[in-house]
């Protein structure tokens, strides 16, 4: 009888085992395990009748189509075999075991005890056949295996071969190289590659196969396995295969498709081709006079571009438009896109106007073309060129006037400072009282009028200031502070400030320049209790024109010591003290409550310690700080007073031969102005030079070298 076994393991015994088996018996065991496994059979006990070639009793092990072993006896002899330690391994997943005993047994034979089990087949080691083995990588697992591919490859639907995705290759450059995947290594199997060359209309693609050409072929049938086909419009060239490359191909088209097919077998190295665009030829070009063409070639074809440029100092002129370069292109019909332009000499045109300056031409006929020269100069003596610049500008190749230091920037004509049009009196002789100032003696002197019309009654007061530049006035902070607030320092509104310059006699304002304020800047640390940091600036709405009666004063160098004791300085002012005078009266009527004509006084700087002591000896908390200095005479008689507030205390600098503002009229008291041992207190300007420059937005180097000692 037959026993069907489907387990992954099991035991087979002869009938009656462990007793002796019966005579004339036949049993077949058919063992089937899943695919991917084979069957291993071994015997733990074996005792059968022995016979020549196992004719009587035997155990036969076989598969569907072959006998794997026949066993009998008790021990192995030349003609019969017992399994002993031997293991029988099926080649596949099926094994049949047949036990047969003949009709007579002279002895009692105990038969056999066998065991079987399913064992995994390592397909990766055992597959020899290329048709079945993995193309790249094989991975065994219990009961089966699977294939995978190298990076860049995709497993084919046959789950065995590795192909590439190569159907989306677009080439748009005018030249290029195309190869089979992985060239020069063998190309992948089971792949369909598509290469598209798509150039601009007007080009024609030429193909040339190079180096190795190795595509699997067949001795009789043309290219049945792997091949290249070239599709040009409706026309198909090929298939091509084997080891001989096709001849160069002129497609006469701007669009070409290359198809490459590989089947699932073979190891061939593939192919490489280069393509090149060909186009119509354009006529030879002649460069313009004073110009050149780049690139310079013997021949130019469709899509070639040339750049026309001119020699230094010349510009490309095309249709009356000047440009640096001009590009023309060879068109598909073999003509140039434009005519060659001409080269025209660069013209810098009329140079820019210089504020407070003039221009002279160095070149004849006032030429403004390349390499022409001009010279800027400032309106002397009121303006001086910043940094002593030469003012010489040359017409550059770029068409702009260029200076060696400033480049294309115009020079700056800075107001000359501290140089009155009229000489101030000698300081050798001491002047006891104030005296009238001649016009032009204090050209920096400003009258500041503050008139607050926002309240009833209108509030108004006056002070002095000093012109620092065409746009800035230096004064004392207390002049520009609203007294309505005491616990906080609030500047007056700029709308309420008017500045008069070039004013000599307040009865005659015709020659004066009046300006409104664009900004009022009080020193941020101004202290109303002790007048420390009593300094402020007014920016004028418009720069004022400079002249003999309106010129700035120089700022000192930054020096904490300030002016030296006993040095003589001058202060000017109108000494306005009557509050009940209208602005119109002040400016035009020349009322008797103030000086009609600008007054000035000559005062010595008082040693700091002496001044401090003189104020400390008075009742009250007067403090003469390091930001102040004093000037005046012990015996009194000359002093500055209320309306002079903010006015400049100037000292002549011998080295630069200029007048420098060292102080601003700040405070004094408690006795009347000009009293004995009541020195006037002045803001020490040299402590604030950096702050002043910062507010004015000018570099410190602008004027400072002019007052170096």
């Amino acid at each position: 009888h037959t026993v069907e076994l489907n387990n992954m393991f099991g035991q087979i015994q002869s009938p009656g085992y462990p007793d002796s088996y019966p005579s004339d018996s036949e049993v077949t065991w058919n063992i089937t395990v899943p695919d991917g496994f084979r069957i291993k059979l071994y015997f733990m006990h074996f005792n059968l009748e022995s016979s020549y070639l196992c004719e009587y009793d035997y155990v036969k092990v076989e598969t569907e189509d072959q006998v794997l072993a026949t066993f009998c006896g008790r021990e192995t002899t030349d003609t019969e075999q017992t399994p002993g330690q031997e293991v029988v391994l099926s080649p596949g997943s099926f094994m049949s075991i047949t036990f047969r005993s003949d009709f007579s047994n002279e002895e009692r034979f105990t038969g056999f005890d066998a065991h079987y089990m399913a064992v995994d087949v390592d397909e990766c080691k055992e597959r020899e056949d290329e048709e079945l083995s993995c193309d790249h990588y094989c991975h065994n697992y219990i009961g089966g295996y699977y294939c995978s591919c190298r990076f860049g490859y995709i497993l084919h639907t046959d789950n065995r071969t590795c192909r590439v995705e190569c159907s989306d290759n677009l080439f748009t450059q005018r030249t290029g190289v195309i190869t089979s995947p992985d060239f020069p290594n063998p190309y992948p199997k089971s792949s369909e590659c598509l290469y598209t060359i798509e150039l601009e209309e007007g080009f024609m693609v030429n193909l040339q196969f190079e180096d190795i050409f190795d595509i699997e072929d067949h001795p009789e049938v043309p290219c049945p396995y792997d091949y290249i086909k070239i599709k040009v419009g409706p026309k198909v060239l090929g298939p091509f295969c084997g080891e001989k490359a096709p001849e160069p191909i002129s497609t006469q088209s701007h669009s070409v498709l290359i198809l490459f097919h590989s089947d699932n077998s073979g190891e061939n190295r593939g192919w490489r081709l280069s393509y090149r665009a060909a186009g119509n030829e354009c006529p030879e070009l002649q460069p313009p006079v004073h110009g050149k063409i780049e690139p310079s070639q013997a021949k130019y074809f469709f899509k070639d571009q040339v750049l026309v440029s001119c020699d230094t100092g010349y510009k490309v002129l095309k249709d009356n438009v000047e440009m640096d370069t001009f590009q023309i292109e060879c068109l598909k019909d073999g003509t140039w896109s434009n005519k060659i332009p001409t080269c025209k000499i660069v013209d810098c045109r009329a140079p820019g106007e210089l504020e407070h300056g003039l221009i002279t031409f160095s070149t004849r006929n006032n030429l403004t073309t390349y390499k022409s020269e001009i010279k800027y100069s400032c309106q002397e003596p009121y303006y001086k060129m910043l940094n002593n610049n030469t003012g010489i500008y040359t017409c550059s190749a770029q068409g702009v006037w260029m200076n060696k230091v400033l480049g294309r920037s115009l020079p700056t004509c800075l107001p000359e400072c501290g140089q009155p049009s009229r000489s101030l009196p000698s300081l050798v002789k001491r002047i006891i009282g104030g005296r009238n100032a001649e016009p032009g003696l204090f050209p920096w002197q400003a009258l500041i009028v503050v008139e607050d019309t926002s309240r009833v009654p209108n509030d108004k007061w006056f002070g002095s200031g000093a012109l620092l530049s065409a746009s800035w006035i230096l004064t004392a902070a207390h002049v520009l502070r609203s007294q309505r607030r005491d616990t906080t320092v609030i500047p007056v509104s700029k709308e309420h400030v008017t500045v008069y310059l070039g004013l000599h006699d307040v009865r005659d304002k015709s020659g004066a320049v009046n300006s409104s304020a664009a900004r009022v800047v009080l020193h941020p640390d101004f202290n109303i209790q002790n007048y420390n940091h009593d300094i402020a600036l007014v920016q004028l709405q418009e720069p004022v024109p400079l002249g003999p009666h309106v010129m700035p004063v120089c700022l000192p160098r930054l020096e904490p010591e300030g002016p030296a004791p006993h040095m003589l300085g001058l202060v000017a002012g109108w000494g306005i003290s009557n509050p009940n005078v209208t602005v119109d009266e002040i400016i035009s009527s020349g009322t008797r409550t103030l000086s009609d004509v600008l007054q000035y006084v000559k005062l010595p700087v008082v040693p700091h310690a002496e001044c401090k002591t003189s104020y400390e000896s008075r009742s009250g908390n007067y403090s003469v700080t390091e930001n102040m200095f004093c000037a005046g005479y012990y015996e009194g008689g000359k002093d500055t007073c209320l309306g002079d507030s903010g006015g400049a205390f100037v000292i002549f600098d011998d080295l630069s031969q200029r007048w420098v503002v060292q102080g601003l009229v700040s405070w004094g008291g408690p006795e009347e102005c000009g009293s004995k041992q009541v020195y006037g207190v002045y803001t020490k300007v040299s402590n604030y030079v950096d702050w002043v420059w910062e507010q004015m937005g000018l570099p410190q180097s602008v004027v400072e070298p002019q007052v170096e000692r």
Partner: antibody, heavy 116, light 112 residues
Framework: QIQLVQSGSELKKPGASVKVSCKAS????????MSWVRQAPGKGLKWMGW????????TYADDFKGRFVFSLDTSVRTPYLQISSLKAEDTAVYFC?????????WGQGTLVTVSS | DVLMTQTPLSLSVTPGQPASISCKSS???????????LNWLLQRPGQSPKRLIY???KLDSGVPDRFSGSGSGTDFTLKISRVEAEDVGVYYC?????????FGQGTKVEIK
Amino acid sequence: QIQLVQSGSELKKPGASVKVSCKASGYIFTSYGMSWVRQAPGKGLKWMGWINTYSGVPTYADDFKGRFVFSLDTSVRTPYLQISSLKAEDTAVYFCARGGEAMDYWGQGTLVTVSS
Amino acid sequence: DVLMTQTPLSLSVTPGQPASISCKSSQSLLDSAGKTYLNWLLQRPGQSPKRLIYLVSKLDSGVPDRFSGSGSGTDFTLKISRVEAEDVGVYYCWQGTHFPWTFGQGTKVEIK
């Protein structure tokens, strides 16, 4: 030290005038305005106005426009309050106080009595 | 004019105890520059006034730190943490933001 010293008490008949002074010392006089404040007997304080000591311009509260005048003599650092056409209801202590809005230091006060 | 209202109008305090005075204005005292000009002064019996606090909370020099000021907009407070005998008198608040400057009606502080 900062001091405001006012003139002494005044006894005036109705219709007369009076001028009260307030001498300042111990600080930069033109740095601060000067306020005037009235205190009627047993009553609270009432701000009368102030004078800008730099410009000399006075500003009056509405109730004190007309008969009241603030003035200044900068040379002696003294502001003045003058009241004309005195009435019985002007009887009060008048204080000067340093500052337009600060009023950080006060005079000792001047009693003006208006009685027939 | 801005009306300044003080509460209470009188206050009797045991020495060492705290005291608080409120001052309300009829409109905000914050000016366009962001400052609040609210001040407090004390007028002791028979004396001229003396300023204690300015700009809401800043103490004048020489004023003991038991005094403090607070508030914003229209509501302000003067506090005395521990009242002493010398603190008796009339306390006034006043504003210097809106012209004309105006005083509160005063708060009389006396010792129990």
